[in-house]
Amino acid sequence: AGVFELQIHSFGPGPGPGAPRSPCSARLPCRLFFRVCLKPGLSEEAAESPCALGAALSARGPVYTEQPGAPAPDLPLPDGLLQVPFRDAWPGTFSFIIETWREELGDQIGGPAWSLLARVAGRRRLAAGGPWARDIQRAGAWELRFSYRARCEPPAVGTACTRLCRPRSAPSRCGPGLRPCAPLEDECEAPLVCRAGCSPEHGFCEQPGECRCLEGWTGPLCTVPVSTSSCLSPRGPSSATTGCLVPGPGPCDGNPCANGGSCSETPRSFECTCPRGFYGLRCEVSGVTCADGPCFNGGLCVGGADPDSAYICHCPPGFQGSNCEKRVDRCSLQPCRNGGLCLDLGHALRCRCRAGFAGPRCEHDLDDCAGRACANGGTCVEGGGAHRCSCALGFGGRDCRERADPCAARPCAHGGRCYAHFSGLVCACAPGYMGARCEFPVHPDGASALPAAPPGLRPGDPQRYL
């Protein structure tokens, strides 16, 4: 376990032309606050959920009012560090998002208004216990300067906060085979000789040979998740519960929700439903009310102003989550037809249609034939965003300008011979067959299989196909 710490040094206009306008004015004083979101791993796919390592909100900065005519200076910042506690090992590689939020303090109907000024993101390698790392990130015309570090909470030490340290038993040196705990030279690395088979993920030991379980796990080797299902049974006067075997680890096994929050599995992660007065991915932030602005991305906060009062975030379209922190890409399933470009405007989806198409989803095919001509008596057929010609017999090609060979497809059946003709083609049928394409056998007695041959046409005569 440990804490990620973020120190904001400055937030103000970046170098170069196009300095941003001050976010505050005499008419509309405001103050800043920051939000940090941490995810494990260096790639987007490594993040199991939004802010899977944790998130934190800063305090509000001092109220700032722009001096008329003055350029936007570095804006006054909140005091103190942003601290994101982590319960498990520090992953070493992480992604961060730091958001700068503006709280407007003018006469707002329904309380203060929040808006996102800037968002910076990055991916970094960082060993726990190391020195402060300095960073500069730019978002548009704004520049954010900050430092960060990860430190272990005693008794954990090491670059991942997975080693345990204990005070020295003797003043001069550590026990046999044990190293001093740098930088805590007066402490020694604890021997991690737990009971054989003790779960390395869910168990730990403070004395050799023991196996103590992390919250949510039970059993002699801490391999059994404590279930919240009906199989719990009381044990002794304290009504403590025995574990239930639930196959396969799930994100709610070992309940990651703090402060009495209840855990629900989501399609890829988990979600904590927090009791009144708590919020955060794991209900780890306490005493939050609407005055703290817990709703992101323009979410509307509804709830009382006293610390014990719950709040609810009503999210705008395109966002969800208990704090409106999850963005939904509604264009992902390509709702625009016929190659239209999808635009998620937040309040609505819009499709920008290719030429020849229209409609909310580009589903309507416009008249492609306007101003188009098909040669040699062809007729224009619209469709697919481009005009097509249905050509008269004997012609082909895109505009019916090419002469077609009607016999190319061998249309005469049963060995009939094909002759090109000004009005199409003529089939000279082999003996025993008749019809426009020689498709009908002539009965042995000379009667046709057809009801009657057209006047002036005898079986065996060449048939002209019109």
Partner: antibody, heavy 124, light 106 residues
Framework: QITLKESGPTLVKPTQTLTLTCTFS??????????VGWIRQPPGKALEWLAH???????RYSPSLKSRLTITKDTSKNQVVLTMTNMDPVDTATYYC????????????????WGQGTLVTVSS | DIQMTQSPSSLSASVGDRVTITCSAS?????MYWYQQKPGKAPKLLIY???NLASGVPSRFSGSGSGTDFTLTISSLQPEDFATYYC?????????FGQGTKLEIK
């Protein structure tokens, strides 16, 4: 063109284990955002979600059936396998597999393509 | 578990009618998904993320709602629309479906 097809036994005896395979084409479970789920429908009844698996091997099971279900994927074969132990006549149903898409980390975009389904009867 | 309750359970209507099916969730679900199923066939996705039309679905279908109450509307019923319709939530496990609404020809 995206297609999914379920295969497996049509008749199983009570207490036996059912193994169903979903073979799909037109997308890959090595692509970020892709998943495959299993849904069943007893004759004349409503749909019931059973389990799903994502490209990065994140799995979810219906809590009421979790102890009996196992879902696995073979990315190279474009297959997802569901096993269900200790079958009972009440498990008689048409079993469907379907593609699930999630482009937003934890928000499902849609379960947009379904297999034709395979009817599994549990009877001695 | 989040319970999904559809109403009505069955509905008789005529070609050209405007039809509305509602789905009520026992707790907030953020988004709703709607499927159409015809006898002997697999379900087909109609609406995703509450109001977005799936590919190839006619524009007479529309979805709306938020929180716990959602609606599927067919603006002018066509012969091919007579089927059973299901809603589904993807918020919390188990990812439950409604009991279905059977739309029959009057």
């Amino acid at each position: 063109q995206i297609t999914l097809k379920e295969s497996g036994p049509t008749l199983v005896k009570p207490t036996q284990t059912l193994t169903l395979t979903c073979t799909f084409s037109g997308f890959s479970l090595s692509t970020s955002g892709m998943g495959v789920g299993w849904i069943r429908q007893p004759p004349g009844k409503a749909l019931e979600w059973l389990a799903h698996i994502w490209w990065d091997d994140v799995k979810r099971y219906s809590p009421s059936l979790k102890s009996r279900l196992t879902i696995t994927k073979d990315t190279s074969k474009n297959q997802v396998v569901l096993t269900m132990t200790n079958m009972d006549p009440v498990d008689t149903a048409t079993y469907y597999c379907a593609r699930i898409v999630s482009f937003d980390n934890d928000v499902v975009s849609a379960m947009d393509y379904w297999g034709q389904g395979t009817l599994v009867t549990v009877s001695s | 578990d989040i319970q999904m309750t559809q109403s009505p359970s069955s509905l008789s209507a005529s070609v050209g009618d405007r039809v509305t099916i509602t789905c009520s969730a026992s707790s907030s679900v953020s988004y709703m998904y709607w499927y159409q199923q015809k006898p002997g066939k697999a379900p087909k996705l109609l609406i995703y993320l509450t109001s977005n039309l799936a590919s190839g679905v006619p524009s007479r279908f529309s979805g709306s709602g938020s929180g716990t109450d959602f609606t599927l509307t067919i603006s002018s019923l066509q012969p091919e629309d007579f089927a059973t319709y299901y809603c589904q939530q993807w918020r919390h496990n188990p990812f439950t479906f409604g009991q279905g609404t059977k739309l029959e020809i009057k």
